[in-house]
């Protein structure tokens, strides 16, 4: 067991003339917070898998108000470390996602609004007990500097936190076959950590995590006596050399426990010990709750306020998967005609048409547009004998040469707030609404679809929406 620790050093605009404006203003003060999600790095888990190694949410940072006319500085950060405890061995290679969130503290009715500012990800090799590792990453116009480490919780030591150390029983030396624990030379390496639950009386191990049985005992944890009463035992036929000690097919054969659960035999059947995040007779049900923040890309988490009710992520347009982690490849349906290029902007599909074609799906043949140039990916469209440029997101003007404010068209419904974002725009919805453009009421039929908040978590807290 141990703890992964993340220290955020700075979050601010990257260098260069294209630096972003501050995310806060005098009218809308705000503060930052961070979320980290960890997964084992070399497992072939799907991108949508939950944060199998754990996740953590930081405290809120100090309130920040932009000084008019001043460039955006590094923004004030929350105090302290983000800590993700891990129960089992540290995997050595891990994947991380770090998200930077903004909490607005303006006069929103019903409490603050949240929006995602930046997200960085990576896969790294890291030994537990080693020094802090540093990283610098860019996400859009922002730059994040951070350090991380994994440390073992006593008495565990070693690069994977699988060895145990105990104070010496004798002042001069360790017991038979046990070495001093570097760097704690005054402590001794304890016997190997066997598989969790391995019988101390009837089992032993030569490698961490295994459980080998003494003669007369069987089962994954060496807790089941081998039957010697009758060679007609339901556990299998006798053996000429070992009498009745050869076990036949047992209830744990083939491991009926799903999702990495470990099986132990009981007198009547078997029992599954499930890893964190799963439950059920065979560990077949995900026990992740909304409090774990399992929904990505602005997905809304519903249900699962306690481990006995599974959660569901309601995904915004453009995303799918059990955790809203997969971008829907709507371009695979080839919606753009006449050789148009399909762009999936997440909130909408856009067809970038070849010269001479226009319309939402490039369905209009416009010969008179052939000689007209629309800059920055704009498309020439005909209207009543004239032609004009339909500009790509972020551009405007007659020829799409002017930078446009993507929020100018007030795209966020139901009082949602619009923010220009490095990949387009982001809507921070008023309480009671969801979706990329705040177009969906959370409780259309009058009954709230949001579950009761878990202890210590207000309804609508961002942990529910990650």
């Amino acid at each position: 067991a141990g703890v992964f620790e993340l220290q955020i050093h700075s979050f601010g605009p990257g260098p260069g003339p294209g630096a972003p404006r501050s995310p806060c203003s005098a009218r809308l003060p705000c503060r930052l917070f961070f979320r980290v999600c960890l997964k084992p790095g070399l497992s072939e888990e799907a991108a949508e898998s939950p944060c199998a190694l754990g996740a953590a949410l930081s405290a809120r940072g100090p309130v920040y108000t932009e000084q008019p006319g001043a460039p955006a500085p590094d923004l004030p950060l929350p105090d302290g470390l983000l800590q993700v405890p891990f129960r089992d061995a540290w995997p050595g290679t891990f994947s991380f996602i770090i998200e930077t969130w903004r909490e607005e503290l303006g006069d929103q009715i019903g409490g603050p609004a949240w929006s995602l500012l930046a997200r960085v990800a990576g896969r790294r090799r890291l030994a537990a007990g080693g020094p802090w590792a540093r990283d610098i990453q860019r996400a859009g116009a922002w730059e994040l500097r951070f350090s991380y480490r994994a440390r073992c919780e006593p008495p565990a030591v070693g690069t994977a936190c699988t060895r145990l150390c105990r104070p010496r029983s004798a002042p001069s030396r360790c017991g038979p076959g046990l070495r001093p624990c570097a760097p704690l030379e005054d402590e001794c390496e304890a016997p190997l950590v066997c598989r969790a639950g391995c019988s101390p009386e009837h089992g032993f191990c030569e490698q961490p995590g295994e459980c080998r049985c003494l003669e007369g005992w069987t089962g994954p944890l060496c807790t089941v006596p081998v039957s010697t009463s009758s060679c007609l035992s339901p556990r299998g036929p006798s053996s000429a050399t070992t009498g009745c000690l050869v076990p036949g097919p047992g209830p744990c054969d083939g491991n009926p426990c799903a999702n990495g659960g470990s099986c132990s035999e009981t007198p009547r059947s078997f029992e599954c010990t499930c890893p964190r995040g799963f439950y059920g007779l065979r560990c077949e049900v995900s026990g992740v709750t909304c409090a774990d923040g399992p929904c990505f890309n602005g997905g809304l988490c519903v249900g699962g306020a306690d481990p006995d009710s599974a959660y569901i992520c309601h995904c915004p347009p453009g995303f799918q998967g059990s955790n809203c982690e997969k971008r829907v490849d709507r371009c695979s349906l080839q919606p753009c005609r006449n050789g148009g290029l399909c762009l999936d902007l997440g909130h909408a599909l856009r067809c970038r048409c070849r010269a001479g074609f226009a319309g939402p799906r490039c369905e209009h043949d416009l010969d008179d547009c052939a000689g007209r140039a629309c800059a920055n990916g704009g498309t020439c469209v005909e209207g009543g004998g004239a032609h004009r440029c339909s500009c790509a997101l972020g551009f405007g003007g007659r020829d799409c040469r002017e930078r446009a404010d993507p929020c100018a068209a007030r795209p966020c419904a139901h009082g949602g707030r619009c923010y220009a974002h490095f990949s387009g725009l982001v809507c921070a919805c008023a309480p009671g609404y969801m979706g990329a453009r705040c177009e969906f009421p959370v409780h259309p039929d009058g009954a709230s679809a949001l579950p009761a908040a878990p202890p210590g978590l207000r309804p609508g807290d961002p942990q529910r929406y990650l």
């Epitope: 990800a121 610098i136 730059e143």
Partner: antibody, heavy 117, light 107 residues
Framework: QVQLVQSGAEVKKPGASVKVSCKAS????????IHWIRQAPGQGLEWMGY????????EFNQNFKDRVTMTRDTSTSTVYMELSSLRSEDTAVYYC??????????WGQGTTVTVSS | AIQLTQSPSSLSASVGDRVTITCRAS??????LAWYQQKPGKAPKLLIY???SLEDGVPSRFSGSGSGTDFTLTISSLQPEDFATYFC?????????FGGGTKLEIK
């Protein structure tokens, strides 16, 4: 304006070592990492490793781990990359680049290293 | 190490054409992909980072898209100075790796 200026071309014999320098200017030297990338004639790009000038921490591509050394001199804002036990396949243009882990935004002009007997 | 496969390896086009280059990663790299332009005898120049962010000073005719394993670099209207070799680079895992390059030539 960020600038990285590298040392001149080198011709070396197999088994020898080469030390290439990269002098940085136009920014706070310790604020960003310096990466080294090489490109054999007519080939693609291969990352060799980086040095964090603040901590002198280095990380290398396993392909070069036992042969490459990276050092820095903060007084002159210069980073050095030394490659030992040279072989003919080390003939390449060696570039230094300024950045973090997911961006190399400014590059040196390159140093040609020829390994020939 | 993560492998990046670029296609096509070479491409002939004319000034004013719209050009698309693709890069496929051997596994999910989220949005950790950058695009570089290299002209003969010169160092590579960063165009796009984190899949779709345009580096300062790069003309807006360059754009990047994609996430996960499939990425695209698009030049909306080729200019004479755009004829060069283009490389993609993943920065999700260590070591960072580059695609084999796409040589863009004048038709």
């Amino acid at each position: 304006q960020v600038q990285l200026v590298q040392s001149g071309a080198e011709v070396k014999k197999p088994g020898a070592s080469v030390k290439v320098s990269c002098k940085a200017s136009g920014y706070t030297f310790t604020r960003y990492w310096i990466h080294w990338i090489r490109q054999a004639p007519g080939q693609g790009l291969e990352w060799m490793g980086y040095i964090n000038p603040t901590t002198v921490y280095t990380e290398f591509n396993q392909n070069f781990k036992d042969r490459v050394t990276m050092t820095r001199d903060t007084s002159t804002s210069t980073v050095y990359m030394e490659l030992s036990s040279l072989r003919s396949e080390d003939t390449a243009v060696y570039y230094c680049a300024h950045g973090g882990s997911n961006f190399f935004d400014y590059w040196g002009q390159g140093t040609t290293v020829t390994v020939s007997s | 190490a993560i492998q990046l496969t670029q296609s096509p390896s070479s491409l002939s086009a004319s000034v004013g054409d719209r050009v698309t280059i693709t890069c496929r990663a051997s596994e999910n790299i989220y949005y950790n992909l950058a695009w570089y332009q290299q002209k003969p005898g010169k160092a590579p120049k960063l165009l796009i980072y984190t899949a779709n962010s345009l580096e300062d000073g790069v003309p807006s005719r360059f754009s990047g898209s994609g996430s996960g394993t499939d990425f695209t670099l698009t030049i909306s209207s080729l200019q004479p100075e755009d004829f060069a070799t283009y490389f993609c680079k993943q920065a999700y895992d260590v070591p960072p790796t580059f695609g084999g390059g796409t040589k863009l030539e004048i038709k």
